[in-house]
Interface confidence: low
């Protein structure tokens, strides 16, 4: 039956604490200013409905659609036009023109203070207070920060988040076992959010298309004893699934992924051998599990490529009959035997293929025209496995902070109108890809490496959509979406750049960065040198590396001086002279 | 469970009219681009429309064009097929198929099909 009620529906699959934290998420992304008891305000309004529905599917209202109802409870906001300006707007409109509209004010920067930890005792002290509102809290600042976290996957950390104080709170060294554990999950939610925003930027920004391909490669590595067919399902439905989060809809999409990772686990034998410790999860970690399940091994003895998508007389003919179907079925045959590449590299060998064939097919001997297809592929390879080579070397050579710095110079010569808070971020970012991935042997590095730069690339594209002010970066952000990081690579420094003029107190530190942690202090520096090139982009390694030095020995020797304060007024001075003589300003 | 349900079809005489609907249970047809499909004793099964799941985009074989019409209620979780000047030669079993989002170019393309409904054109 079509069911009467889609929230009764939702409700009954997904349970009540599933369904008000799923609510919760959805308002809280939506509406990223409101405060946290105005939106459990709004979540238990909601359950109480759904729950009249359950009860009676033919009640008032319990048919509207699920836009429908989270729209007009959104829409009673009472400070919606002075919170949110033009996004008040959107209630004036029907869905399902509403919901874009809400979709459109997503804020991937969004003016919000930062998260400070408390001390332990505090949040162990609030946590057992009340553990319901604790844990809808750590749900709510994680949701309006990130407004395209992945919904279902912000259940599994939350369950991550509430055993880490149940276990801690408990322990006689309380801190040592919490931090860590805090740590972790803050940088795994990080990254969890920067890869669906990824996700989601492909299906709105290149369509369901760009998705599925990404999906069939994907899958097609990580199941490669699976048949087409099969990898063919679990693309439409995991499209299905990313579709619904990206598109706000948290409820069907968390519902959708539990089916998802219930067929999995039923078929795990026509999938996958990795999937067995998996499937013997609870729900949450099980589809955490199978998100990141290691790829199965290659089935032995695949034959050539060659043979039925070059030597083969019916080539074009298949093209024809289903131009999709059989790129897909290139995509998969190639992806399956190359673990070792990245998903955007499969991509673009697809694509160079799909251009040989659209024209190749239409020439007078297609078969002598697409015959040597296979050799186009090898500067594509080659180039994404030169350059981690590169930079795998320069990494090792320089640790993390100091290849973090050679980027920050790298990106802020290559586009320096972009922000420094953005370049700074982004830099950092990229600088990872070394200690997460040049440890890794030749043939996970490339997967690992180049995947990992579309992920934070795409953080780049989705900042700088928002203000845009330099043309290279949204050329790159929208030509192609898997030739990004090539496109990045390209740029050389922009010689229409008009230098910052100097301005001292960018250069002016204070006493209070003796406090700040590694990290931050980090931060601090690389903010100053973002700000230096930009002042003189056209300045050498050598000039910027000796300024850097000068800087860390002037915050080291401040640091230790009795009178913190006068150091850093007097030798910054000093520092700042000096620098401007070094670099000619 | 999810399923497709055919309904409307019958005997029709050349010249007349008649209105399939596919219901679909266990999903929502929101997201599901909708084809109708038929198939002739003997004959392979082939296209006939197909409406994306927005609406906004609709296609038809060159063989009914001007004479079917293909909608959607989603709100009631069906699709339509109007077929009006109805011809011997569109006497077949007709099937609706449903595939996330968009048309598919190919049969195999589509997730979910109906157990389908035969339509007879004839005098």
């Known amino acids: 039956d079509a069911h009467k009620s889609e929230v009764a529906h939702r409700f009954k699959d997904l349970g009540e604490e599933n369904f008000k934290a799923l609510v919760l998420i959805a308002f809280a992304q939506y509406l990223q200013q409101c405060p946290f008891e105005d939106h459990v305000k709004l979540v238990n309004e909601v359950t109480e409905f759904a729950k009249t529905c359950v009860a009676d599917e033919s009640a008032e209202n319990c048919d509207k659609s699920l836009h429908t109802l989270f729209g007009d409870k959104l829409c009673t906001v009472a400070t919606l036009r002075e919170t949110y300006g033009e996004m008040a707007d959107c209630c004036a409109k029907q869905e399902p023109e509403r919901n874009e509209c809400f979709l459109q004010h997503k804020d991937d920067n969004p003016n919000l203070p930062r998260l400070v930890r408390p001390e332990v005792d505090v949040m162990c002290t609030a946590f057992h207070d009340n553990e319901e509102t604790f844990l809808k809290k750590y749900l709510y600042e994680i949701a309006r920060r990130h407004p395209y976290f992945y919904a279902p996957e912000l259940l599994f950390f939350a369950k991550r988040y509430k055993a880490a104080f149940t276990e801690c709170c408990q322990a006689a060294d309380k801190a040592a076992c919490l931090l860590p554990k805090l740590d972790e999950l803050r940088d795994e939610g990080k990254a969890s959010s920067a890869k669906q925003r990824l996700k989601c930027a492909s299906l709105q920004k290149f369509g369901e298309r760009a998705f599925k391909a990404w999906a069939v490669a994907r899958l097609s590595q990580r199941f490669p004893k699976a048949e087409f067919a099969e990898v063919s399902k679990l693309v439409t439905d995991l499209t299905k699934v990313h579709t619904e989060c990206c598109h706000g809809d948290l409820l069907e999409c968390a519902d959708d992924r539990a089916d998802l990772a219930k067929y999995i686990c039923e078929n795990q034998d026509s999938i996958s051998s990795k999937l067995k410790e998996c499937c013997e999860k609870p729900l949450l970690e099980k589809s955490h599990c199978i998100a990141e399940v290691e790829n199965d091994e290659m089935p032995a003895d695949l034959p050539s490529l060659a043979a039925d998508f070059v030597e083969s007389k019916d080539v074009c003919k298949n093209y024809a009959e289903a131009k999709d179907v059989f790129l897909g079925m290139f995509l998969y045959e190639y992806a399956r035997r190359h673990p070792d590449y990245s998903v955007v590299l499969l991509l673009r060998l697809a694509k160079t293929y799909e251009t040989t064939l659209e024209k190749c097919c239409a020439a007078a001997d297609p078969h002598e025209c697409y015959a040597k297809v296979f050799d186009e592929f090898k500067p594509l390879v080659e180039e994404p496995q030169n350059l981690i080579k590169q930079n795998c070397e320069l990494f090792e050579q320089l640790g993390e902070y100091k290849f973090q710095n050679a980027l920050l110079v790298r990106y802020t010569k290559k586009v320096p109108q972009v922000s420094t808070p953005t370049l700074v971020e982004v830099s950092r970012n990229l600088g990872k890809v070394g200690s997460k991935c040049c440890k890794h042997p030749e043939a996970k590095r490339m997967p690992c490496a180049e995947d990992y730069l579309s992920v934070v690339l795409n953080q780049l594209c989705v900042l700088h959509e928002k203000t845009p002010v330099s043309d290279r970066v949204t050329k790159c952000c929208t030509e192609s979406l898997v030739n990004r990081r090539p496109c990045f690579s390209a740029l050389e420094v922009d010689e229409t750049y008009v230098p910052k003029e100097f301005n001292a107190e960018t250069f002016t530190f204070h006493a209070d960065i003796c406090t700040l942690s590694e990290k931050e202090r980090q931060i601090k520096k690389q903010t100053a040198l973002v700000e230096l090139v930009k002042h003189k982009p056209k300045a050498t390694k050598e000039q910027l590396k000796a300024v850097m030095d000068d800087f860390a020995a002037f915050v080291e020797k401040c640091c230790k001086a009795d009178d913190k304060e006068t150091c850093f007024a007097e030798e910054g001075k000093k520092l700042v002279a000096a620098s401007q003589a070094a670099l000619g300003l | 469970q999810v399923q497709l349900q055919e309904s409307g079809g019958g005997l029709v005489q050349p010249g007349g009219s008649l209105r399939l609907s596919c219901a679909a249970s266990?999903?929502?047809?929101?997201?599901?681009?909708i084809g109708w499909f038929r198939q002739a004793p003997g004959k392979e099964r082939e296209g006939v429309s197909c409406?994306?799941?927005?609406?906004?985009?609709?296609n038809y074989a060159d063989s009914v064009k001007g004479r079917f019409t293909i909608s959607r209620d989603n709100a009631k979780n069906t699709v339509y097929l109007q077929m009006n000047k109805l011809k011997p030669e569109d006497t077949a079993v007709y099937y609706c198929?449903?595939?996330?989002?968009?048309?598919?170019?190919?049969?195999?393309?589509?997730?979910?099909w109906g157990q389908g409904t035969q339509v007879t054109v004839s005098s």
């Open positions: 198929a449903a595939a996330v989002l968009e048309c598919r170019t190919v049969v195999r393309g589509y997730d979910y």
């Open positions: 266990g999903f929502t047809l929101d997201y599901y681009a």
């Open positions: 409406i994306a799941s927005s609406g906004g985009s609709t």
